[in-house]
């Protein structure tokens, strides 16, 4: 075994190094001391370290470790934060375009239904945005709300434009009739299915990205235990006490220490792998009715078709509703 | 029949992009993200090794420090002796993860469960009763998945028609992307050291 080089007789080297860590403090002994009070850098002979120095080394070692961890996760963190923001903005843009497409469809095909239709369409897409951002809204309720609101306007403006203003109190009756008579056929149900499937997937995708950020942030800001601090100090700084300033830790030893310090963090590994693979599976399935871009940007067409369906059955509907809602003030329609 | 109501848009560049075949779509961006994430799949298991390789460790020196003394780099003492009479490493591992780590593991388990639930086989997923009285399936055929929209000539086939929106200064990986401040993007040389961490075992 090679003999250790003789320790610095004056601790001068150790002092000049320690001054860089803690300027102005007189904690370094002038000459090597027995060091019986040391708890981490247990000396085999005289040492240039004091108890105070040891404490400072421990603090520095833990800070170094935290910085190394943060630099390790920097690129991954940047990747997820950036994409979470980009996708959220992208989804908002899709919602805005879908609203514009739908409004344009009303303006071009059914100008008599605006501005009320614009209001209902606006409220519907506001609900869509809220849902994507995590609000607890029931998609079926959103779609029913849209068609419940639209039908009275369609009936009074398109199907029965001759109704006097006083007849506008039949709106409540028309809302009820809309569901019971399946006025729009199965279009509302089709929209419910498509919208709920695509928005559910979109929402969970965003939630997953945000959780990814939370995972990295959590491990990024871990505070390492005192035991870990001692092990790191022994590995990185105890050699200095013997005046061995240029010596580096052995690779295998470093791995053992790091595995000890990071035992808890490494437990995340299994779930992190599963997270990435599950996210990949989700993304692979985000097409057709599971792709909100497809579904929302095509909604104007389905809504248009649903109104055409009403118009096609207008004769039959007008007769039925005429009877049903003739006495809407007296009877309450469910 | 309804048509794409393009006349509504003032921002014509959005529409130009809307029909260019090879523009980046949201789905291609998603796939690209997954590919990048997969290079980090071993991030946590590789962390100890990464940190050792990024802190001072004896690589070419004959002698190295094992926590107690100077030893030859390839001797058994290089890994073992320094751990004797020290804090019990096994004990440190047995303590289990910090409460915050346990919490985040629980959250990961929960999201993984949700992701799996959402990723069920995507066969004929729409309710079969969509074809009942009152619904005309037009040219949708049996697979309702194919159709976004309702019936007949109002139908829009959505294959390839929805291109990503130029409104987003989108490819944030490009340093000179419009509206992308250069400080915000770590340069390649700053981050490449860690890029293959996922492949370290």
């Amino acid at each position: 075994q090679p003999p250790p080089p003789p320790p610095d007789a004056t601790c001068h080297q150790v002092r000049s190094f320690f001054q860089r860590l803690q300027p102005g403090l007189k904690w370094v002994p002038e000459t090597p001391v027995p060091g019986s009070d040391l708890q981490v850098c247990l000396p085999k002979g005289p040492t240039c370290c004091s108890r105070k120095m040891e404490e400072k080394y421990q603090l520095t070692a833990r800070l170094n470790m935290e910085q190394l961890l943060q630099s390790a996760s920097m690129e991954l963190k940047f990747l997820i934060i950036q994409n979470a923001a980009v996708f959220q903005e992208a989804f908002e843009i899709v919602v805005r375009h879908a609203k514009n497409y739908t409004n344009a469809m009303f303006k071009n095909n059914y100008p008599s239904l605006t501005p009320q239709a614009f209001e209902f369409v606006g409220e519907f897409f506001t609900d869509v945005s809220l849902y994507i951002l995590g609000s607890d809204i029931n998609v079926d309720d959103m779609v029913n709300e849209l068609f419940d609101s639209l039908f009275p306007v369609i009936y009074t403006q398109l199907m029965n434009p001759g109704l006097p203003d006083s007849a506008l109190d039949i709106n409540e009756c028309l809302r009820g009739a809309r569901r019971d008579l399946k006025v729009f056929g199965n279009f509302p149900k089709l929209i419910m299915t498509q919208v709920s499937k695509s928005l559910q997937v979109t929402r969970i995708f965003l939630q997953a990205l945000n959780l990814g950020i939370e995972v990295i942030n959590t491990t990024d800001h871990l505070k390492f235990s005192k035991d870990c601090g001692r092990m790191l100090t022994r590995m990185w700084y105890c050699s200095y006490c013997q005046g061995l300033m240029m010596v580096k830790p052995c690779g295998g030893y470093c791995n053992v220490v790091m595995q000890g310090c990071m035992a808890g963090v490494v437990e995340i590994d299994k779930y992190w792998r599963e997270y990435i693979l599950s996210l990949e599976e989700l993304v692979n399935g985000m097409y057709r009715i599971y792709d909100m871009e497809n579904v929302l940007l095509g909604l104007f067409s389905t809504i248009h078709d649903s109104i055409q369906y009403v118009q096609k059955n207008a004769g039959k509907l007008t007769t039925t509703i005429g009877k049903l809602c003739a006495h809407s003030q007296q009877r309450q329609y469910r | 029949s309804a048509y794409y109501p393009e006349d509504l848009f003032i921002d014509k560049k959005v529409l130009k992009v809307a029909h260019v075949e090879h523009e980046e779509t949201l789905s291609s961006r998603r796939r690209e993200l997954i590919q990048k994430l997969k290079s980090f799949i071993s991030f946590y298991s590789a962390l100890p090794g990464y940190i050792c390789s990024h802190s001072p460790v004896a690589e070419n020196d004959t002698l190295c420090w094992n926590g107690q003394e100077l030893v030859e780099r390839y001797s058994q003492k290089a890994a073992r002796n320094g751990m004797k009479n020290q804090f019990n490493l096994h004990e440190l591992k047995m303590k289990g993860p910090e409460p915050v780590v346990s919490q985040i593991i629980d959250k990961l388990k929960h999201i993984n469960q949700l992701l799996r639930t959402m990723s069920m086989p995507k066969g004929r997923v729409l309710d079969k009763n969509l074809d009942e009285e009152g619904f005309e399936s037009g040219d949708c055929g049996d697979d309702e998945d194919e159709c976004i929209g309702g019936s007949g000539d109002g139908m829009i086939k959505v294959k390839n028609q929805l291109r990503f929106l130029a409104e987003l200064a989108y490819d944030l990986d490009v340093d000179d992307a419009p509206g992308n401040s250069q400080q915000a993007t770590p340069k390649d040389n700053e981050i490449s050291t860690f890029h293959n961490l996922g492949n370290v075992h």
């Epitope: 609900d127 809220l130 995590g134 809204i137 309720d141 569901r179 | -």
Partner: antibody
Amino acid sequence: QVQLQESGGGLVQPGRSLRLSCAASGFTFSSYAMHWVRQAPGKGLEWVSAISSSGGSTYYADSVKGRFTISRDNSKNTLYLQMNSLRAEDTAVYYCAKDRRGSHADAFDVWGQGTLVTVSS
Amino acid sequence: QSALTQPPSASGSPGQSVTISCTGTSSDVGLMHNVSWYQQYPGKAPKLLIYKSSSRPSGVPDRFSGSKSGTSASLAITGLQAEDGADYYCQSYDSSLRVVFGGGTKVTVLG
């Protein structure tokens, strides 16, 4: 005539339960979200709970979460509020209110006259 | 969830104008959420005056108007009348879709 009529209020001891009902008429009940709002004597309005048109989503104020349950029976045009583990601070006039929308809270365009709940030993 | 902030009182002479402010946060009024205003007389149920920040239900006089900017909303009453003496509440909802009310403002018509 659009109307909401609350019932079920009264004097109750702390820790006990009470169930409020609200009968709706004159509008398509199943098409609108519904709410309970309360007002303690001499105080302002405090929202208690809401339910969407289908009953698929429910919402609660922090002060009642876990103790109160909102529900609706669209076939009977009736809204309910089951109040358990009542406390003195739950003493108030409880109003039933109709939302102008179906999917979630927006604005309350029809209100009942209120029913007084007094929690005291 | 925290309440929206309103001044406790406001007053004016008949014919004058009164404005009541309502301040929220970025998670309620400041979001895309609408603000509503209610009028309440003592011992009576509240009545909707304004919804969607500036829309008036039929039957509400056009002396009442609402506006919203950022995280604040306001109700203006022009040409104050004796019957306008009442309590006024603003209301919105937060990102969890839970409703928030303001603390209420007592409007007094002087003289």
